[in-house]
């Protein structure tokens, strides 16, 4: 149902990275506006992005209330300048989004190597624990706070002078690896949630190499 001069939204798509979550849809509006509603499976609908001409709506503030819940959104279409108008069934035209469970589906953002420190033949590589928009007791939680041991990191490292790579895993944000004395190494990390079936891995971090400013070298 709906008014004759509005079209229903379509291609409703969740775009979410580290819990920053935006609902996108089509088409670009012509003589119409949109309002978005979101709810959990058992909850009430909450309206967002009232009468907007955008084709996206930031729903982060809603989903971070409980990232383990499953959410559903819907996009209502209204005639521009006549938002009270309803369809023949007495309500505006709308389309439902796919269900979205942030904890299981948000993409893992590209990680960053915070630092590396060499002490003799050991190197400690630290991954930045990125802040999310998920809050607890009025403070923003880090990715590690949210995922705990469900989140691991994979490190790739190699001698600057060769192509042979090695790998290591950690369930913290630190790696302690053995290196050959007098050799420079390059590092790249990847975030992984092994228990997932989709969106399991992040893209690789930028490569950081010894001999550059991020690291510190101490001969013991």
């Amino acid at each position: 149902s709906g008014t004759t001069n509005t079209v229903a939204a379509y291609n409703l798509t969740w775009k979410s990275t580290n819990f920053k979550t935006i609902l996108e849809w089509e088409p670009k509006p012509v003589n119409q506006v949109y309002t978005v509603q979101i709810s959990t499976k058992s909850g009430d609908w909450k309206s967002k992005c009232f009468y907007t001409t955008d084709t996206e709506c930031d729903l982060t503030d809603e989903i971070v209330k409980d990232v383990k819940q499953t959410y559903l959104a819907r996009v209502f279409s209204y005639p521009a300048g006549n938002v009270e108008s309803t369809g023949s069934a007495g309500e505006p035209l709308y389309e439902n989004s796919p269900e979205f469970t942030p904890y299981l589906e948000t993409n893992l953002g590209q990680p960053t190597i915070q630092s590396f420190e060499q002490v003799g033949t050991k190197v400690n590589v630290t991954v930045e624990d990125e802040r999310t928009l998920v809050r607890r007791n009025n403070t923003f939680l880090s990715l590690r706070d949210v995922f705990g041991k469900d989140l691991i990191y994979t490190l790739y490292y190699w001698k600057s002078s060769s192509s042979g790579k090695k790998t290591a895993k950690t369930n913290t944000n630190e790696f302690l690896i053995d290196v050959d004395k007098g050799e420079n190494y390059c590092f790249s990390v990847q975030a992984v949630i092994p228990s997932r079936t989709v969106n399991r891995k992040s893209t690789d971090s930028p490569v950081e190499c010894m001999g550059q400013e991020k690291g510190e070298f101490r001969e013991i």
Epitope: I152, T154, Y156, K165, K166, T167, A168, K169, T170, N171, T172, I177, Q190, V192, I193, P194, S195, T197, V198, R200, K201, T203, D204
Partner: antibody, heavy 117, light 107 residues
């Protein structure tokens, strides 16, 4: 369902190379890591190396470094292992396995490679 | 490289027995330890992942424990289908290394 289907048995001459394949189905290989494991007759399991199909990184056991190349073709969901300079001790069953990050949770049926003159 | 010492290399047991197999790593592997069962002429099968978690479809008589360098696979009540060879694997860093295997035979 998840399946790893390996290529058939191979008979090869010493000094030559062999390339075996592992076709994955039921999952996207870019979401996982893929490995090859060697088992000589009556012996234990030995890790050869692995590949991250998402970025092309390959890692090898130093014992095989220089003789082995592991690659992945994400368009066909196939992982390959090429082993060169074959010798009699390379006669073994070679398994491909999927690594979830927590374990090698699925294995291929194995490919027997026999090296004989 | 990390060495994995698995013991015993073989054991004889009866149906209903409690069986324990251990793996010791030469350094902390942060629970990146998994256990596999292999029967003759078959591919290995995943039993335990992340040291303590039971893989899908694996009977609850199998359990894993341990952290740091010391890990254990326990079969609480051995069944006829459990006679096989068991391997641990550390995948905390490359090169990944398997234990030498434990062959569980019928007494």
């Amino acid at each position: 369902q998840v399946q790893l289907l390996e290529s058939g048995a191979v008979l090869a001459r010493p000094g030559t190379s062999v390339k075996i394949s592992c076709k994955a189905s039921g999952f996207n290989i870019k979401d996982y890591y893929m490995h090859w494991v060697k088992q000589r007759p009556g012996q234990g399991l030995e890790w050869i190396g692995g590949n991250d199909p998402a970025n092309g990184h390959s890692m090898y056991d130093p014992k095989f470094q220089g003789r082995v190349t592991i690659t992945a073709d994400t368009s066909t969901s196939t992982v390959f292992m090429e082993l060169s300079s074959l010798r009699s001790e390379d006669t073994a069953v070679y398994y491909c396995a999927r690594d979830s990050g927590y374990a090698m949770d699925y294995w291929g049926q194995g490919t027997l490679v026999t090296v004989s003159s | 490289d990390i060495q994995m010492t698995q013991s015993p290399s073989s054991l004889s047991a009866s149906v209903g027995d409690r069986v324990t197999i251990t793996c010791k790593a030469s350094q902390d592997i942060k629970s990146f330890l998994s256990w596999y069962q292999q029967k003759p002429e078959k591919a290995p099968k995943s039993l335990i992942y992340y040291a303590t978690s039971l893989a899908d479809g694996v009977p609850s008589r199998f359990s894993g424990s341990g952290s740091g360098t010391d890990y254990t696979l326990t079969i609480s009540s051995l069944q006829p289908e459990d006679f096989a060879t068991y391997y641990c694997l550390q995948h905390g860093e490359s090169p990944y290394t398997f234990g030498g295997g434990t062959k569980v035979e019928i007494k």
